[in-house]
């Protein structure tokens, strides 16, 4: 018996085309994914193949301002469309807390919305009731087939899912859900969830009776044969794990963006055991036509957007300095303001212990693009946003060593005076250069705030200790040369989209008048 | 026609084991997960154990935890219920029953649908 | 001890309507399906009905079952004197992962 898996992951409201980079479309003839093109796509294979399933492994939420106009109802409403068979919750599903998650997705999907290791707890656990589940068993032509949900146990630090949410442990979790469903006769399995491919590979490992592990969070594009866009795999599709049962267990994501979907073929024999596995993503590219009612609804909705981008979030009552002569050479309130906004959005009260789980932010001064002058009444719009960020980028958590840190800041400065972008704005650190100092040897002074402790305070900077950073996800990816911090990461979880964050922080301040006022100092 | 035929019944002193067996034809055994259900003299229905479809998975009530033994042999179409370390409570009628997944449109309904014709196990000094 | 909870009798004259009750928790009922069986003594127990109405074949339509929430009924519209028996629901527990009866009701006919 065969089964056709079409998956996506990390779609994070790229329900437009967009271009290659998954930046907005300018160019339409070279432009990629989106819902309309998606569904051509799925219907096409749902024509030509009889047993099809079509899931996504989590955060369909967070990305562009389509979410941040419909806050998920546009998830429910296009996913709904393209008959989704079953979605596993992500961290970016919580971004907007639970009440984000229940009022417009949950109640409105028509398509079971799964984890398995998120379990409710208190007065939530009556309201939440069912609206997810564990598990699903569905119908596929004559046979059944089980899908058991995940979601990544950082997800408290990571996005805002309140204290009646316990995440546990995802192997812990799934293996009575599917010890169950072996008992109540599914012998087809597949764990769909949102915890990044290295736990991807452990439940393929350790959860006996998986067959098929479909994931998501990490971004992972595998691809067998020559990839056909700029995507470097990660390793082979789908990525075969040998279970400790000893089964061959493949498992798969798609990258994310909506950019590819994920397509394995899997044959089962009449006991559900995997007899073959094969696939590719499939590119959306623009050979790939949009579907003219899909497309149609979309541009319905656009409508809302566009008169969102024009109105007020807030007032600055100073100049907020984004210029390049400035962002790029020395501390500017743009970079102060954008860092703020970065930790303000990464408030989540870890215990007694910490005052906050993470206090640093580090952006690269290239990375903001314009100025936002205060004399046009002090407002502030979107669209002004837009162009101070403009790139559609998130702004992710990393836990780094100090000494990564430390590399980071003398590459800050290592060709300093000649405009470039890789010059860091701050939050949380105080850092102090002396360019008299040959290159590589130029930090005399960094200090950093304190997490574990009362009342935030600055200790210099210890080499061996691991810390957790703010940072756009262009300088996890190494870009700007920061090649060591995308060499020596220890963890990246991607955040929310940068625009967004800036904006939240503005509409919630209301007034600001951000400062320079010495984090970054020259002697 | 799908049939549960049970055997191995009778009386056993406290302490001692028995072992109970359902013979399974007229439908692909293999494929289900098998239960095991008693009746005391009086009392309702009590569950026992259940087995999956390939004899990886094994639940058990705690009334039973730790003495009984669920096993299947699916080449000889086979149920058993191994029974040690019996006590005066467990003198009841067992019953082996077939649990079925049923598919009505899109829903699924988990139930017991084929059930053995019983045997008595006494427990008495 | 059961956990689920089955009034201990019912019973109604020919022709009348009788319904049974049976309430358990968010571990079984809540989030499994429920199903009904019938048990006469000397015999084994058979499968009468399953959540939502749904009958095996030979089951007359007399009887229904309904669920909500975390309780279920059993209604026998129309009583016959061969429906007097012991009835009990069931479903799966997660929690204690396992299959659970209720406490079986006897329902008689006057």
């Known amino acids: 018996w065969e089964l056709t898996i079409l998956h996506t992951n990390d779609v994070h409201s790229r329900l437009e085309q967009t271009s290659e980079d998954s930046s907005k479309c300018v160019n339409a003839s070279r432009c990629m994914g989106g819902v309309a093109r998606l569904f051509t796509k799925v219907q096409q294979i749902r024509r030509a193949e009889p047993n099809v399933l079509l899931l996504d492994a989590g955060d369909q939420y967070q990305g562009t301002i389509w979410f941040t106009v419909y806050k998920g109802a546009e998830v429910a409403h296009f996913m709904n469309a393209l008959r989704y068979d079953a979605m596993a919750l992500g961290n970016h599903e919580f971004d907007n807390g639970v009440e984000g998650l229940i009022e417009p997705l949950l109640k409105e999907a028509k398509f079971p919305i799964l984890s398995a290791n998120i379990k409710a707890k208190g007065p939530l656990a009556s309201q939440i009731s069912g609206l997810y589940l564990p598990y699903k068993v569905l119908p596929v032509g004559d046979e059944v087939v089980g899908i058991v949900g995940y979601t990544s146990k950082e997800t408290p630090f990571l996005s805002n899912p309140g204290t009646n949410l316990v995440f546990e442990d995802e192997i812990t979790a799934l293996q009575p859900e599917v010890d169950k469903l072996k008992t109540l006769n599914v012998n087809k399995i597949i764990a769909l969830g949102h915890s990044g491919f290295e736990t991807d590979k452990l439940i393929a490992q350790k959860v006996r009776g998986v067959d098929v592990v479909v994931g998501g969070h990490s971004n992972t594009f595998l691809y067998t044969g020559n990839p056909p866009s700029k995507e470097v795999p990660a390793g082979k599709y789908p990525f075969i794990v040998t279970s400790d049962d000893g089964r061959k267990v493949p498992v798969v994501q798609a990258y994310a963006f909506g950019k590819y979907l994920g397509y394995l073929k899997i044959e089962f024999d009449e006991r559900g055991n995997v007899i073959s596995s094969h696939g590719n993503p499939i590119l959306l590219n623009s050979s790939i036509p949009e579907d003219p009612s899909i497309k149609a609804d979309i541009n319905k909705w656009r409508i809302k957007l566009d008169n969102y981008s024009t109105q007020e979030l807030g007032k600055t009552i100073v100049y907020l300095d984004g210029s390049s002569q400035s962002c790029r050479f020395r501390e500017c309130n743009m970079g102060n303001l954008i860092c703020d906004a970065m930790i303000n959005n990464n408030l989540r009260h870890a215990d007694e212990m910490f005052w906050n789980h993470v206090s640093m932010c580090i952006l690269n001064g290239g990375g903001i693009r314009s100025p936002i002058d205060e004399r046009n009444n002090g407002t502030i719009t979107w669209e002004n946003l837009a162009a101070v960020l403009p790139f559609g980028g998130t702004f992710d958590l990393v836990q780094l060593k100090g000494s990564t840190l430390k590399k980071a800041f003398e590459h800050s400065v290592h060709r300093y005076g000649q405009s470039t972008g890789e010059f860091l704005q701050v939050g949380g650190i105080h850092v102090v250069y002396d360019l008299s100092r040959k290159p590589g040897d130029r930090v005399v002074k960094l200090d950093v705030l304190c997490t574990k402790c009362r009342v935030p305070s600055y200790d210099p900077l210890k080499m061996d200790e691991i810390y957790k950073v703010i940072l756009p996800n262009f300088l996890a990816n190494g870009g700007d040369g920061f090649q060591m911090i995308k060499d020596e990461l220890l963890r990246h979880d991607s955040g929310d989209q940068d625009i967004n964050v800036v904006s939240t922080y503005i509409s919630k301040m209301k007034v600001i008048y951000p400062a320079v006022e010495g984090r970054i100092k020259f002697s | 026609q799908v049939q549960l035929v049970q055997s191995g019944g009778g009386v056993v002193q406290p302490g001692r084991s028995l072992r109970l067996s359902c013979a399974a034809s007229g439908f692909t055994f293999s494929s289900y997960g098998m239960h095991w259900v008693r009746q005391a003299p009086g009392k309702g229905l009590e569950w026992v154990a259940v087995i999956s479809y390939d004899g990886s998975i094994k639940y058990y009530a705690d009334s039973v935890k730790g003495r009984f033994t669920i096993s299947r042999d699916n080449s000889k179409n086979s149920l058993f219920l191994q029974m040690n370390s019996l006590r005066d409570d467990d003198t009841a009628t067992y019953y082996c029953?077939?649990?079925?997944?049923?598919?009505?449109?899109?829903?699924?309904?988990?139930?017991?649908?084929?059930w053995g014709q019983g045997t008595l196990v006494t427990v008495s000094s | 001890q059961s956990v689920l909870t089955q009034p201990p009798s019912a019973s109604g004259t020919p022709g009348q309507r009788v319904t049974i009750s049976c309430s358990g928790s968010?571990?079984?009922?809540?989030?499994?399906?429920v199903s009904w069986y019938q048990h006469l003594p000397g015999t084994a127990p058979q499968l009468l009905i399953y959540t939502n109405n749904h009958r095996p074949s030979g089951v007359p339509d007399r009887f229904s079952g309904s669920k909500s929430g975390t309780s279920a009924s059993l209604a026998i519209s129309g009583l016959q004197s061969e429906d007097e028996a012991d009835y009990y629901c069931?479903?799966?527990?997660?929690?204690?992962?396992?299959?659970?009866f209720g406490t079986g009701t006897k329902v008689t006919v006057l």
């Open positions: 968010s571990s079984n009922i809540g989030s499994n399906t």
């Open positions: 029953a077939r649990g079925h997944l049923l598919r009505i449109g899109d829903i699924f309904y988990y139930s017991l649908d084929v």
């Open positions: 069931a479903a799966w527990d997660d929690s204690l992962s396992g299959y659970v």
